[in-house]
């Protein structure tokens, strides 16, 4: 069988408050219950793990507490988004997915989404 | 289904050989990484070496460079592992594992893996 695609954006631009959000879908080539996404950061070839959530279809995304991302499911789409981002986050997000469940085990991994990232300019002070 | 079979551990002296195999079947593409990695009881799974299927990159852990050799038969869908010098910090289970990437990907990290076989165990005792 073929890898499993998974496609994102190429490109977005976060928001002044260092919020990006991206949709990651990939074509099941099964009835899969249980998913796990995961988004990497690659960055001059290295490659971090951002955040983790498995979910079951139907159900929300759960990441952890203290995660920088949240999420929902639709179907073979996840929304996701990743705040507190600044200008050195700045580098190719990639979407992982593993249908983990009933079997086969099947993995697929987008191609990323570049993620530009701009920290505000700081006010200036006023005299008033 | 994606399937990898490893073949070809055993018990080998220190100083001595082996060639490990890894069959591949169920998938296809023009694109993918390979990879042998090892685990004992007490360590986390690492990276040996790997090789990319177009161009043939390949990486390999600072601990076996210049005695592990990694290579590919596109033809028979099998990657091997020539292992020489082999040392009993060498002992632990093989495994291989796949991972469906595109040219955009770094080569060979261990993130892009979850395709994986059973595993072939390497004792390395006198």
């Known amino acids: 069988c073929k890898a499993m695609h998974v496609a994102q954006p190429a490109v977005v631009l976060a928001s002044s408050r260092g919020i990006a959000s991206f949709v990651c879908e990939y074509a099941s080539p099964g009835k899969a219950t249980e998913v796990r996404v995961t988004v990497l950061r690659q960055a001059d070839s290295q490659v971090t793990e951002v955040c983790a959530a498995t979910y079951m279809m139907g159900n929300e995304l759960t990441f952890l507490d203290d995660s920088i991302c949240t999420g929902t499911s639709s179907g073979n789409q996840v929304n996701l988004t990743i705040q507190g981002l600044r200008a050195m986050d700045t580098g190719l997000y990639i979407c992982k997915v593993e249908l983990m469940y009933p079997p086969p085990y099947y993995l697929g991994i987008g191609n990323g989404t570049q993620i530009y990232v701009i920290d505000p300019e700081p006010c200036p002070d006023s005299d008033f | 289904q994606v399937q990898l079979v490893e073949s070809g551990g055993g018990l080998v002296q220190p100083g001595g050989s082996l060639r490990l195999s890894c069959a591949v079947s169920g998938f296809s593409s023009d694109y993918y990484d390979i990879g042998w990695f090892r685990q004992d009881p007490e360590k986390e799974r690492e990276m040996v070496s790997c090789?990319?299927?177009?161009?043939?990159?390949?990486k390999y852990a600072d601990s076996v460079k210049g005695r592990f050799t990694i290579s590919r038969d596109n033809a028979k869908n099998t990657v091997y592992l020539q292992m020489n010098s082999l040392e009993p910090e060498d002992t632990a289970v093989y495994y291989c594992g796949l991972a469906p990437i595109s040219p955009v990907h770094a080569v060979c990290n261990q993130h892009y893996f979850g395709y994986w076989g059973q595993g072939t165990r390497v004792t390395v005792s006198s």
């Open positions: 090789i990319r299927s177009s161009g043939g990159s390949t």
